[in-house]
């Protein structure tokens, strides 16, 4: 069986600046050298890809330049940060981990992190 357990926090509250961070941890069954991490958002039974990065073990995650995600890796743990979030982005963010190389291929899917985003109240007008 090529099952792989992926753990992530159940709930995270985004900061007032629309930034949310969480850890995605996977129980690697083998000695993978190439790992792909994908963040997917599930809302209203629709699944969309938020961002994805492939990295070599021991190296940094590299997301596309226009990605809203950044991250670092340490062993079997990936620290993910999603920025630019608004209230409408509230939803379940699922961490998917694929061990790409060497074979065999493994796939693990977390249960998801519910990210709550609250848009900040606009500052009241001031005479000063």
């Amino acid at each position: 069986c090529k099952a792989m357990h992926v753990a992530q926090p159940a709930v995270v509250l985004a900061s007032s600046r629309g930034i949310a961070s969480f850890v995605c941890e996977y129980a690697s069954p083998g000695k993978a050298t190439e790992v792909r991490v994908t963040v997917l958002r599930q809302a209203d039974s629709q699944v969309t890809e938020v961002c994805a990065a492939t990295y070599m073990m021991g190296n940094e995650l590299t997301f596309l330049d226009d990605s809203i995600c950044t991250g670092t890796s340490s062993g079997n743990q990936v620290n993910l940060t999603i920025q630019g979030l608004r209230a409408m982005d509230t939803g379940l963010y699922i961490c998917k981990v694929e061990l790409m190389y060497p074979p065999p291929y493994y796939l693990g899917i977390g249960n998801g992190t519910q990210i709550y985003v609250i848009d900040p109240e606009p500052c009241p007008d001031s005479d000063f």
């Epitope: 069986c1 090529k2 099952a3 790409m100 074979p103 065999p104 291929y105 796939l107 899917i109």
Partner: nanobody
């Protein structure tokens, strides 16, 4: 990135034949079991045939005796020979690993697995 590329679909008359191919340019093929899935309009995706790395095959009752799955391990390719096609075989066909290999439900694998674009098979006179 997992890259599964399905081809070989098309329009065929009832009782006709088609041969689908699926090439894997990534590493998923090294998994023991590969399968062909299909999704008809308005219906759930279903697994119709699987093949292990050693060549053992399994089929859904609806295609038994008509479809044959095979694989070429050297080319990282899996095939589906479809004979005696029926209008109810009309669907988009996808190849992927057997979802059970990952300890996932079919629904979860459909939602979160890595899928190719599929190839359309239309059986109509």
């Amino acid at each position: 990135e997992v890259q599964l590329v399905e081809s070989g679909g098309g329009l065929v008359q009832p009782a006709g034949s088609l041969r689908l191919s699926c090439a894997d340019s990534g590493s998923i093929f090294s998994i023991n079991t590969m399968g062909w899935y299909r999704q008809a309009p308005g219906k759930q995706r279903e697994l119709v045939a699987t093949i292990t790395s050693s060549g053992s095959t399994n089929y859904a009752d609806s295609v038994k005796g008509r479809f044959t799955i095979s694989r070429d391990n050297a080319k990282n390719t899996v095939y589906l020979q479809m004979n005696s096609l029926k209008p109810e075989d009309t669907a988009v066909y996808y190849c992927n690993a057997d979802y059970r290999d990952f300890g996932l439900s079919m629904e979860r694998f459909i939602d979160f697995g890595s899928w190719g674009q599929g190839t359309q098979v239309t059986v109509s006179s």
